[in-house]
């Protein structure tokens, strides 16, 4: 028998520095977690102790903090090289800055192979990107070789900016021939490494003949066997075992997100490459693991540029940006409109001639807007200003909801109106009218939404049975502020870009902004 240790990360999302337990900015260092310096300590410890070790990343290193905003992926290549990753799969967020923003900082600079079997380049891009990412890699480990096949969410064109010269094929259809090639090469130990979410990971384990292990990402899935060490609630045991269609037991793993855990899976193979046993658990990278001094010093060196960046002007406002709780928790506020407009702008994807855009709606809990921005400072808006407005380090995500769920959400928005509570919704692409004289749960008297399947966008009444795409904070997608109906009833959830980054990009693009209060949210006569 031959034993392989798979160390894995996914959805690190720019958390190069240690973070608090909830993966936001580290405040009390003695209680902070993750970060590449701490990760390196643990990886090196395992490499020294065990003979056959692979360090893999399942995508979405890009996007999430000011590190990515400033360094645009160069930081990913640099620190992943320093940690000596063996391979990485492309995630959807790797395309956030377009194909060029992937090629130059990461594909050309990474010292490790970057994989995806289901992304096919065409046109002029084909020759430019040739060899910079691969469908599979044969990695020599000890006296054996291990095949790694990569995959990426086929939803990427709706979630990011891959452009028109990359085709995202069905994962299973694309993976099978590559696995067959590896088998032809007498590579009999094969890992599928990719970024399509836990449901697809399980399908790959079930359907792709010859895959021995699946290491996934995208859905931030936390798996654990035994008592979990932190706040995350396991979605199943680690590894999660799937019985394949040809009767094999295939371990599937994921390691939550944000570099908080290091996935640790030990696999025992027989001489024919069959999995005999698999066991392990994610390792919580808490403060009991010291940060590696040399990596930490490098982080501190790179940090300097971030501090300079946060005070630079992004753009100007010529109006007061009202982000006060007195406004945003009670009525339409222009800060809410600005943020929602930025959220929609960030999700412009012309992927179908029938649709002017794939999504037109935004909802945003007023309680998530934490500060106004005064225009009387020469109109200057900085990253620092935006960090005061959006201090939680969240993301603006894409969900699919039925109209009936949206209706419930808007009822929840005003179910206890008047108490300055955070659930009051700011909107974009939505016109809502409330009648507060009616009983809670029946206060939405009009709810019109902007069409997407139209050449001239207009507002139409919400249809209860129709499925709509909506951009919202991850906080709401996870049921925050009492929006349990969103969490329970959402049909799809894809995590998006860092909230501050979305707004800062929009302001930089617009240069001068002047958001108004324009009647998106109204109260019917006599009730307010």
């Amino acid at each position: 028998a031959w034993e392989l240790t798979i160390l894995h990360t996914n959805d690190v999302h720019s958390r190069l520095e240690q973070t608090s337990e909830d993966s936001s900015k580290c405040v009390n260092a003695s209680r902070c977690m993750g970060g590449v310096a701490r990760l390196f300590t643990k990886v090196q410890q395992i490499r020294r102790a065990e003979p056959n070790v692979l360090l893999l990343d399942a995508g979405d290193q890009y996007q999430g903090t000011i590190w990515f905003t400033v360094y645009k992926g160069a930081e990913v290549a640099h620190f992943m090289n320093a940690l000596r990753y063996d391979a990485m799969a492309l995630g959807n967020h790797e395309f956030d800055n377009g194909v060029e923003g992937l090629i130059e900082p990461l594909l050309k600079e990474a010292k490790f192979p970057i994989l995806s079997a289901n992304i096919k380049a065409k046109g002029p891009l084909a020759s430019q990107i040739s060899g910079l990412y691969l469908p599979y890699k044969v990695l020599p480990v000890g006296d054996e070789v291990v095949g790694i096949v990569g995959y990426t969410s086929k939803e990427t064109p709706f979630l990011s900016n891959p452009g028109t010269n990359l085709v995202f094929e069905d994962e299973i259809t694309a993976l099978q021939p590559e696995v067959d090639k590896l088998k032809t090469l007498n590579v009999n130990k094969i890992i599928a490494l990719g970024h399509s979410g836990f449901e697809m990971d399980k399908l790959i384990a079930q359907k792709v003949r010859g895959v021995d292990v699946v290491v996934g990402g995208h859905s931030n899935t936390f798996l654990y066997t035994g008592n979990p060490p932190s706040k995350e609630v396991p979605a199943g045991k680690y590894p999660f075992i799937v019985t394949s269609d040809d009767g094999r037991k295939v371990p599937v793993v994921q390691a939550y997100a944000f570099g908080k855990y290091l996935g640790y899976l030990k696999i025992e193979f027989d001489e024919r490459g069959n999995v005999i046993s698999s066991h392990g658990n994610p390792i919580l990278l808490n403060s009991s693991i010291p940060e590696d001094p040399s990596i930490k010093a490098d982080i501190n060196k790179w940090r300097i540029k971030l501090d300079n960046y946060s005070t630079q002007e992004l753009g100007k406002t010529i109006v007061y940006l009202d982000g006060s709780s007195q406004s945003c928790r009670f009525r339409e506020c222009n800060m809410g409109n600005l943020i929602c407009d930025a959220m929609i702008n960030n999700n412009l994807r012309h992927t179908d001639e029938m649709f002017w855009n794939h999504v037109s709606m935004c909802i945003l809990n007023g309680g998530g807007i934490r500060s106004p921005i005064d225009e009387r400072n020469n109109g200057t808006i900085t990253w620092e200003n935006l960090a005061a407005v959006l201090p939680f380090g969240g993301t603006f995500d894409l969900v699919q909801l039925k109209g009936s769920t949206l209706k419930k959400a808007f009822e929840h928005s005003v179910h206890r109106y008047g108490q300055s509570t955070g659930e009051f919704l700011q909107v974009g692409g939505i016109h809502v009218v409330y009648d507060l004289s009616r009983k809670p749960g029946d206060r939405v008297v009009k709810l019109d939404v902007l069409c997407t399947k139209c050449r001239v966008p207009s507002y139409d009444p919400l249809k209860m049975d129709e499925v709509y795409k909506v951009i919202l904070p991850n906080f709401l997608a996870n049921g925050g502020d009492g929006f349990q109906m969103i969490k329970d009833e959402l049909l799809r959830h894809d995590s998006g870009d860092q909230d501050i980054n979305v707004v800062s990009t929009y302001i930089s693009k617009m240069k001068v902004i002047y958001p108004a209060v324009e009647g998106r949210i109204k109260f019917s006569t006599g009730s307010h």
């Epitope: 010292k111 490790f112 060899g131 691969l134 032809t184 090469l185």
Partner: antibody, heavy 119, light 107 residues
Framework: QVQLQQSGAEVKKPGASVKVSCKAS????????IYWVRQRPGQGLEWIGW????????KYNEKFKGRATLTADTSASTAYMELSSLTSEDTAVYYC????????????WGQGTLVTVSS | DIQLTQSPSFLSASVGDRVTITCKAS??????VAWYQQKPGQSPKLLIY???TRHTGVPDRFSGSGSGTEFTLTISSLQPEDFATYYC?????????FGQGTKVEIK
């Protein structure tokens, strides 16, 4: 563009060793295997082995095991092939090569290094 | 070791001719076969890999087929620059091996 530049011709005595270098450019050296192949005068091609500069693992043709040593210097993006206990049978052009997809054919070749073993 | 036997060893042909070279493996190699062209004093050049996939920049008059033990390289219309020696190679089992070569000469 991908280029593999090999060291110059060598004349060696029987029993000696030779070390041929192969400097890679135009791609990330650590991400691709380097293969070594030789061609004796007027003969066909013979695979010697490979090295993966990403972790320095090697694989040899049994025929050359113990005599051939493949190494790499990642800081210089250079691979080396050393052959010891030379005999006249080792007189050949030695090539380094790189693939597009692992193992699947040698897509890029060095210009070759002629090693002559003669007393 | 897997033996690869090419036939013919020598082939005389004219410009415009359709030329077929075969490569037989002593045991099955699925589709793990590559074809190379080599001109005197030059390094070999990859034409085909995975038995039938043309390498970037290789003219479409070159095609490969076969699987298991029998493989074919076809040049649909021989051009003056195609006169060279052609080798097949298997990369299914160690040690990787080459055929003895087929020299295509001008008639």
């Amino acid at each position: 563009q991908v280029q593999l530049q090999q060291s110059g011709a060598e004349v060696k005595k029987p029993g000696a060793s030779v070390k041929v270098s192969c400097k890679a450019s135009g791609y990330t050296f650590t991400r691709y295997y380097i293969y070594w192949v030789r061609q004796r005068p007027g003969q066909g091609l013979e695979w010697i082995g490979w090295i993966y500069p990403g972790n320095f693992n090697t694989k040899y043709n049994e025929k050359f095991k113990g005599r051939a040593t493949l190494t790499a210097d990642t800081s210089a993006s250079t691979a080396y092939m050393e052959l010891s206990s030379l005999t006249s049978e080792d007189t050949a052009v030695y090539y380094c090569a790189r693939d597009v997809y692992d193992y699947a054919g040698f897509a890029y070749w060095g210009q070759g290094t002629l090693v002559t073993v003669s007393s | 070791d897997i033996q690869l036997t090419q036939s013919p060893s020598f082939l005389s042909a004219s410009v415009g001719d359709r030329v077929t070279i075969t490569c037989k493996a002593s045991q099955g190699v699925a589709t793990a076969v590559a074809w190379y062209q080599q001109k005197p004093g030059q390094s070999p050049k990859l034409l085909i890999y995975w038995a039938s996939t043309r390498h970037t920049g290789v003219p479409d008059r070159f095609s490969g087929s076969g699987s298991g033990t029998e493989f074919t390289l076809t040049i649909s219309s021989l051009q003056p620059e195609d006169f060279a020696t052609y080798y097949c190679q298997q990369y299914s089992s160690y040690p990787w091996t080459f055929g003895q070569g087929t020299k295509v000469e001008i008639k």
